[in-house]
């Protein structure tokens, strides 16, 4: 393990992985739920690791596939996380901030519709409030750059630089509350091209832009079947 930075060596020896990259390095190379330690040795956080897609090592921070978990939630839930890593879940903005504070990450968004078509989008750079003294006061601002298409098109770059908004903490740029309008929570601007935490509406819907939408692929009237947002060290 020579050449490993001090904090990484400590994590490696103590078997307290920061993310799914560390878990992969420890020899666990199957998809599944593992424990990571983004905030230090005393606080394990269950996470789903995608160890197969495009070489694996992906730390999944958002996963939806059946509508069993409500994602129309308030600020505290999105800050701390909710759901179960073996089902639908959100890892938590604070955990995501702590991860991207320690390492440089890329982002992959995997999408599936109800016709079983899949598509993805990749971003070479992903971080949450990287320069903030207090990430929460900074609104857990999203930074993404370096889009590469996997058929989904780019619906996320529009949101880069935006604070996260929930129905009870409106930090978007729109005159109305985007989270309430879009039935979700996201890094809304005025309001969105991506609404991956919107209502699970099961395909085509009549209501405007309040489903699990990725506008550049399926538009504002189609709610996706499956979504995964995942990060890997760049």
């Amino acid at each position: 393990v020579s050449g490993i930075r001090g904090d990484a060596l400590e994590r490696f020896c103590l078997q307290q992985p920061l993310d799914c990259d560390d878990i992969y390095a420890q020899g666990y190379q199957s998809d599944g739920v593992y424990l990571i330690y983004p905030s230090g040795p005393s606080v394990p956080v269950p996470v789903f690791c995608d160890m197969t897609t495009e070489g694996g090592k992906w730390t999944v921070f958002q996963k939806r596939f059946n509508g069993s978990v409500s994602f129309f939630r308030g600020w505290n839930d999105y800050k701390l996380g909710f759901g179960r890593a073996d089902g639908e879940y959100w890892l938590g903005l604070q955990n995501m901030h702590l991860l991207t504070l320690k390492q440089k990450y890329e982002l992959r968004v995997d999408l599936e519709d109800f016709e079983n078509n899949t598509a993805y989008a990749k971003y070479a750079d992903f971080s949450i409030s990287p320069n903030a003294v207090s990430a929460e006061e900074d609104g857990y601002t999203l930074f993404v750059a370096g889009f590469e298409d996997g058929g989904a098109g780019d619906s996320l770059s529009y949101h880069s630089g935006q604070k996260f908004s929930t129905f009870d903490r409106d930090q978007d740029l729109f005159v109305q509350n985007c989270a309430a309008l879009s039935s979700g929570a996201f890094w809304f601007r005025s309001c969105h091209f991506a609404n991956l935490n919107g209502f699970y509406l099961g395909g085509s819907h009549l209501s405007y832009a309040n489903g699990i939408n990725w506008a550049q692929w399926k538009g504002f009237y189609y709610s996706l079947k499956r979504t995964e947002m995942k990060i890997r060290r760049a």
Epitope: E54, G55, N116, G151
Partner: antibody, heavy 115, light 106 residues
Framework: QVQLEQSGPGLVAPSQSLSITCTVS????????VHWVRQPPGKGLEWLGV???????NYNSALMSRLSISKDNSKTQVFLKMNSLQTDDTAMYYC?????????WGQGTSVTVSS | DIVLTQTPAIMSVSPGEKVTITCSAS?????MHWFQQKPGTSPKLWIY???NLASGVPARFSGSGSGTSYSLTISRTEAEDAATYYC?????????FGGGTKLEIK
């Protein structure tokens, strides 16, 4: 295992059209996009276009007016059609599966444009 | 269109030597992908997303870079590495390839 098998004519007369079929196995066309790339004799690679899982396509703008990519998911086939061929379209034509990047390639179809 | 310029176009090295092939983009790209092609065969994905080795690629290969400057490195060249290497960007349409670098082994 993943395979892409190409079939198409070896010789095309100038101003005529070209049709190549890429038949895939070992994966579903609802899960992976398919690219088309060509390589003139002794030269480099040129990306022609891609058809994604939902049927949406992107083309090389220099060829868009005479290029068409389509597919039949049930037959696991992807089709390349190019119109108005000229001698400088003589090349080896490849299909390749997406993700990661162009991870699997067909054996290539050699196309000669000549009268 | 983004133009990728590879240097050198041709290089000849002895076995065991370190080799670096560079790929310069006319504007910034997110990732670079590399392909290996041997005469009479289809190209093979060699390195994807700048630094990830494709399945079966020996660990003596590595990739790095960002922005407009990327490289493929072979730490100790072996005879089987003789081939043409192409870089490719997929950051904007149309996707483009570099002109290729032919690696010859003395």
């Amino acid at each position: 295992q993943v395979q892409l098998e190409q079939s198409g004519p070896g010789l095309v007369a100038p101003s005529q059209s070209l049709s190549i079929t890429c038949t895939v196995s070992g994966f579903s066309l609802t899960r992976y996009g398919v690219h088309w790339v060509r390589q003139p004799p002794g030269k480099g690679l040129e990306w022609l276009g891609v058809i994604w899982t939902a049927g949406n396509t992107n083309y090389n703008s220099a060829l868009m007016s005479r290029l068409s990519i389509s597919k039949d998911n049930s037959k696991t086939q992807v089709f390349l059609k190019m119109n108005s061929l000229q001698t400088d379209d003589t090349a080896m034509y490849y299909c390749a599966r997406d993700d990661p990047s162009m991870a699997y390639w067909g054996q290539g179809t050699s196309v000669t444009v000549s009268s | 269109d983004i133009v990728l310029t590879q240097t050198p176009a041709i290089m000849s090295v002895s076995p065991g030597e370190k080799v670096t092939i560079t790929c310069s983009a006319s504007s910034s790209v997110s990732y670079m992908h590399w392909f290996q092609q041997k005469p009479g065969t289809s190209p093979k994905l060699w390195i994807y997303s700048t630094s990830n080795l494709a399945s079966g690629v020996p660990a003596r290969f590595s990739g790095s870079g960002s922005g407009t400057s990327y490289s493929l490195t072979i730490s100790r060249t072996e005879a089987e590495d003789a081939a043409t290497y192409y870089c490719q960007q997929r950051s904007s349409y149309p996707y483009t390839f570099g002109g290729g670098t032919k690696l010859e082994i003395k």
